[in-house]
Amino acid sequence: RKIPKVGHTFFQKPESCPPVPGGSMKLDIGIINENQRVSMSRNIESRSTSPWNYTVTWDPNRYPSEVVQAQCRNLGCINAQGKEDISMNSVPIQQETLVVRRKHQGCSVSFQLEKVLVTVGCTCVTPVIHHVQ
Amino acid sequence: GITIPRNPGCPNSEDKNFPRTVMVNLNIHNRNTNTNPKRSSDYYNRSTSPWNLHRNEDPERYPSVIWEAKCRHLGCINADGNVDYHMNSVPIQQEILVLRREPPHCPNSFRLEKILVSVGCTCVTPIVHHVA
């Protein structure tokens, strides 16, 4: 899947655009907003009625090297008594992000953008019931 | 620090860190995931902490369309379909990386940008602060 060109007619390609070889693009991986703080609600992963755990992977040939994934703890949801209610379902909520992959081919190194699907947490849903005729 | 695995026969010139600027292939390697959460699942309607999805569009960014979740209620939906204010609907937020055209309007020059998105909502037990 290619990155779309700027489609709006009022966008004229500025003279200041850097020269880029065909079939590739220039990517600055110094992240904009890198130091922006994230204030998440505390411990929502254990306070949720559909609680989750986190797993982490780390790959030095991926940028970012660290990717954290959520995994729902239960099939059902936790009720007011703290017990699992299997009449409801804990389901994962997912979000795409981009990563840069470094590839070694012989002695040359190339870089590839990759879309990664990250599970960010879980939510409790009413199940879809399929009636069999 | 960490050393990057490399072919032992190659000259030892490669930096263990990623360079600041790289040339990348225009094709994005991915499983063709569905970027419209409304089409991929109806969890946003079936959840006990339902949310609405708002389209955020920016032609200077890739992906240009990002869907933002906003919880519909402060409380959660109980078995009777009513809002229970003893529980809280809270957004699940995630930092993601996107591409920002830099310089602006340039077709093939980008910089990574970190943005915070609300992906959905979950129902949590509230933190109760007791006032002395």
Epitope: I31, E34, N35, N43, E45, Y54, P64, S65 | L97
Partner: nanobody
Framework: EVQLVESGGGLVQAGGSLRLSCAVS????????MGWFRQAPGKEREIVAR???????AYAEFVKGRFTVSRENTKNTVYLQMNSLNIEDTAVYYC?????????????WGQGTQVTVSS
């Protein structure tokens, strides 16, 4: 200059437990995410666990509930409690610190502590 010093490694029998500690000095400990990594002979370094500034913890798949990472901000220390150790857990264990973002690396590393699990 930020310094990380690991301790608590040693020789333990399979099925046993160890508690690793990592003391951090020279920086603002409470603002760092902390990671535990390990490197076995002839293998690449791999992440074991990480803990962010506000508590959430994440573990590598192979941990399977056997290890617990925790931090004590008042003591500038991070811990790795390792239970049900097996021979495959033999490695040098490293503690690392970095800016608390998913997209930041680990800028500071300890020298490592050897963990040997015998049968």
């Amino acid at each position: 200059e930020v310094q990380l010093v690991e301790s608590g490694g040693g020789l333990v029998q399979a099925g046993g437990s160890l508690r690793l500690s990592c003391a951090v000095s020279g920086g603002t400990f409470s603002t760092y995410k902390m990671g535990w990594f390990r490197q076995a002979p002839g293998k690449e370094r791999e992440i074991v666990a990480r803990i962010s500034t506000n508590g959430p913890t994440a573990y590598a798949e192979f941990v399977k509930g056997r290890f617990t990472v925790s931090r004590e901000n008042t003591k500038n220390t991070v811990y790795l409690q390792m239970n049900s150790l097996n021979i495959e857990d033999t490695a040098v264990y490293y503690c690392a610190a970095g800016y608390d973002s998913l997209f930041a690396g680990y800028d500071y590393w300890g020298q490592g502590t050897q963990v040997t699990v015998s049968s």
